[in-house]
């Protein structure tokens, strides 16, 4: 008889999760020479140890501490790119601008990007049927706690001028409840971060409004300024042209505004 298993509202662990994490780790360490010392089996053991046999609504940041230590990486000053609700463009940008890094360009972010995982209390099994949903079940679930933990650490270690890409098509361009708004903003270290520069990405081709004047951007400016970090904002009216100009900065059309 199959064991009774708790039904959660969210989708279950991504199929072949252990194999995927291990394969991603091996690939990452092959491509990034500075991470060649990383033992991917230990990384998987630490990842697994954070959620296996644990009640999936009672996960803590401490559970991920071994993984965070094993996956330690530093980003050079001025090279951190945060993003909120505009992941694809942020990743397209760092794929072209190879010296800038989002969290998903770092080992731990790369391992977990787009994956779901959870276990069950007192068994060594991975739950492939369902996992807790952040809204409907609980916030202290393995996936949410992981991203909160690594996002906090990513922001804590940033230095110089930090950039953030924001989605200008959303009703709340800056959302206090996003990972950026609730975790990263509050963990930038004023003694190391001189400024936060927001890039507001416009959606419509004919949209010429100055979205840097949006009330939510002003709210972000206020939060950042109160933390003794300078704030700058730029409109990116043409994201397609923006990416093209990152690829080919000498292009004559790139001398005009983007």
């Amino acid at each position: 008889l199959p064991r009774w298993r708790q039904q959660w509202s969210g989708s279950g662990t991504t199929s072949r999760f252990p194999e995927t994490v291990l394969a991603r780790c091996v690939k990452y360490t092959e491509v990034h020479p500075e991470m060649r010392h990383v033992d991917c089996q230990s990384v998987w053991d630490a990842f697994k140890g954070a959620f296996i046999s644990k009640y999936p609504c009672n996960i803590t940041e401490e559970d991920y501490q071994p993984l965070v230590k094993l996956g330690t990486q530093t980003v050079p000053c001025n090279k951190t790119l945060l993003w909120s609700r505009i992941k694809d463009l942020a990743h397209q940008f760092t794929q072209v601008q190879r010296d800038m890094f989002t969290l998903e360009d770092m080992l731990l972010g790369y391992l977990a990007d787009d994956l779901t995982w959870c276990g069950e209390f007192n068994t060594f099994e991975i739950n492939y049927q369902s996992c807790p949903d952040w809204r409907k079940d609980c916030s202290n679930n393995p996936v949410s706690v992981f991203w909160k933990t690594v996002s906090r650490r990513f922001a804590e270690t940033a230095c110089g001028v930090v950039h953030v890409m924001l989605n200008g098509s959303r009703s709340k361009i800056f959302d206090k409840n996003s990972t950026f708004g609730s975790v990263e903003v509050h963990n930038l270290q004023p003694e190391k971060v001189q400024a936060l520069e927001a890039w507001v990405i416009h959606g419509g081709r004919e949209d010429s409004r100055d979205l840097c004047q949006d009330p939510t951007i002003k709210e972000l400016e206020s939060i950042i300024s109160k933390r003794n970090i300078r704030f700058f904002c730029k409109n990116i009216y043409r994201p397609d042209k923006f990416l093209q100009c990152v690829k080919n900065p000498e292009d004559s059309s790139c001398l005009s505004g983007i």
Epitope: E62, L70, T72, T74, K192
Partner: antibody, heavy 118, light 107 residues
Framework: QVQLQQSGAELVKPGASVKISCKAS????????IEWVKQRPGLGLEWIGD????????NYNEKFKGKATFTADTSSNTAYMQLSSLTSEDSAVYYC???????????WGQGTLVTVSA | DIQMNQSPSSLSASLGDTITITCHAS??????LSWYQQKPGNIPKLLIY???NLHTGVPSRFSGSGSGTGFTLTISSLQPEDIATYYC?????????FGGGTKLEIK
Amino acid sequence: QVQLQQSGAELVKPGASVKISCKASGYTFSNYWIEWVKQRPGLGLEWIGDILPGSGTTNYNEKFKGKATFTADTSSNTAYMQLSSLTSEDSAVYYCAGYGNYLWFTYWGQGTLVTVSA
Amino acid sequence: DIQMNQSPSSLSASLGDTITITCHASQNINVWLSWYQQKPGNIPKLLIYKASNLHTGVPSRFSGSGSGTGFTLTISSLQPEDIATYYCQQGQSYPYTFGGGTKLEIK
């Protein structure tokens, strides 16, 4: 090969401060945590805390907060630990350990003996 | 903080004996336990990491086992150079903590 070279023994007066250094060689200093460990004469090992030189991020054992302060100079590949308001309880050998970002301590410095005495 | 209870605190054995040192963690530390050897007047040296992995250059007579909260270090065929104090250490969570040590003497 990986080496951690610590500064020499120190004799200091109660209430004073001391700064111990740990110079790393044989690896990329900024990328790896440096751990600090205390050993009092005839007693066991105590973890004080650690620092990631590349970012300056630190973790301290609650017991040593206010007592130990970690810094690092990436230009000279040197980590420092300052101990303040010294008492006889602080008389000990202090070790730095590091390399690998592991959850264990692979390479150790030779230790720095700090003696607090009037 | 996670407490590491190591036993025995001292141990006397004969050359060629097999000895076992145990370490008990106050909470689950998965496999994040390492063992160190410290000879008199020397620095600690890593013997075993991740509960059972032998560090480079360490003789195969040393072995480690366990996971969760219970761990053991075994030295088979005791040699004179094994006279030392042995410590366990957990790396599961900050602050990292060590066992109190086991002083090994030869009869």
